[in-house]
């Protein structure tokens, strides 16, 4: 059964950064190097996280708090507390099982991580393409001709030399 921590449990007096050392009449001993306790009353200290391989140390382990890791250049964190490091790709690419691949025509990725996403379909909002999309950038939608009052100056996009939205690969 779980006892309420009280006078009957002398270990409850051991603060964070220590453990209750039963081998030494339940006195509070400091956590040994490479370990920590973030709460009081612990019978053992926790093993510090080690930032190795593609992980690098962002914050050293202390007696009361765990180490924090981030990723070496060319990688980015994934998951809670940077539990994984994933390879960066260039803008205009996405990471697949076979490595970094260029975004397919009609999709883009403006970051070094994540997946390629489809260009915005301007016509769904009744708008026209103002700036063509590329692998790295989404299209920019402009007002539809009907939105322009007579005599208003219209921004005329440069005549596409290729099919709309396409850019040199």
């Amino acid at each position: 059964f779980e006892r309420t921590r009280s006078l009957q449990d002398p270990c409850s007096n051991c603060p964070a950064g220590t453990f209750c050392d039963n081998n030494r009449n339940q006195i509070c001993s400091p956590c040994p190097p490479n370990s920590f306790s973030s709460a009081g009353g612990q019978r053992t200290c926790d093993i510090c996280r080690q930032c190795k391989g593609v992980f690098r140390t962002r914050k050293e382990c202390s007696s009361t708090s765990n180490a924090e890791c981030d990723c070496t250049p060319g990688f980015h964190c994934l998951g809670a507390g940077c539990s994984m490091c994933e390879q960066d790709c260039k803008q205009g690419q996405e990471l697949t099982k076979k490595g970094c691949k260029d975004c397919c025509f009609g999709t883009f990725n403006d970051q070094k991580r994540g997946i390629c996403r489809p260009w915005t379909n301007c016509s769904l909002d009744g708008k026209s393409v103002l700036v063509n999309g590329t692998k790295e950038r989404d299209v920019v939608c402009g007002p539809s001709p009907a939105d322009l009052s007579p005599g208003a100056s219209s921004v005329t996009p440069p005549a596409p030399a290729r099919e709309p939205g396409h850019s040199p690969q």
Partner: antibody, heavy 120, light 111 residues
């Protein structure tokens, strides 16, 4: 008496997940880390990771990172180990084991073990 | 990872005789004045049982015919006078470095 009582045997299909429980009694559940160690048939012992039920802190063997999740329910003094994407090589007896005293990081109290069989 | 290698893989000893099991770590398991090496006994159909902690300390309730010695990378578990109930598999374990690792086990039988 300090005791760890585990859930019963499981038979699972490849690709599925299994969740094994470990109910602790006879000590202050939140004061000691609870580990999971597995043993394939006729093989040695392999540490999978542990949880500090007081803080919720977990530490996993990198070999299992991403496939194993260890949790604890303080209200019932029960720890759980979930292993996903099971394959035939995961057929083993899974033990929960409590840390010993102090700074030793050894396994002083063991559950009776749970046999997990992965077979199509 | 620290690799633990036990020798021999199996051992047959007469009742009342001394049994010696060795364990070698691929790197030192000494740290800050402590030796993070432990020994376990496992009988068929049962979970392991802690015998020796930190190389040479006898766990409570374990008969004093069991003893442990060593430091750094080389360790020994000794049973001074083998009893029938000592037939089991014995494992060493290091806790100096994450991940915690075990030896492959040594099977002890009666000759």
């Amino acid at each position: 008496e300090v005791q760890l009582v585990q859930s019963g045997a499981e038979v699972k299909k490849p690709g599925s997940s299994v969740k094994v429980s470990c109910k602790a009694s006879g000590y202050t559940f939140t004061s000691y880390g609870l580990n999971w160690v597995r043993q394939a048939p006729g093989q040695g012992l392999e540490w999978m990771g542990y949880i500090n039920p007081g803080s919720g802190y977990t530490k996993y063997n990198e070999k299992f990172e991403g496939r194993v999740t260890i949790t604890a329910d303080k209200s019932t003094s029960t720890a759980y180990m979930e292993l996903s994407s099971l394959r035939s090589e995961d057929t083993a007896v899974y033990y929960c084991a409590r840390w010993g005293l102090g700074r030793n990081w050894n396994f002083a109290v063991w559950g009776q073990g749970t046999l997990v069989t992965v077979s199509s | 990872d620290i690799v633990m290698t036990q020798s021999p893989d199996s051992l047959a000893v007469s009742l009342g005789e001394r049994a010696t099991i060795n364990c070698r770590a691929s790197e030192s398991v000494d740290s800050y004045g402590n030796t993070f090496m432990h020994w376990y006994q496992q009988k068929p159909g049962q979970p392991p049982k802690l015998l020796i902690y930190r190389a040479s300390n006898l766990e409570s309730g374990v008969p004093d015919r069991f003893s442990g010695s060593g430091s750094g990378t080389d360790f020994t578990l000794t049973i001074s006078s083998l009893q029938a109930e000592d037939v089991a598999v014995y494992y060493c374990q290091q806790s100096n470095e994450d991940p915690l690792t075990f030896g492959q086990g040594t099977k002890l039988e009666i000759k």
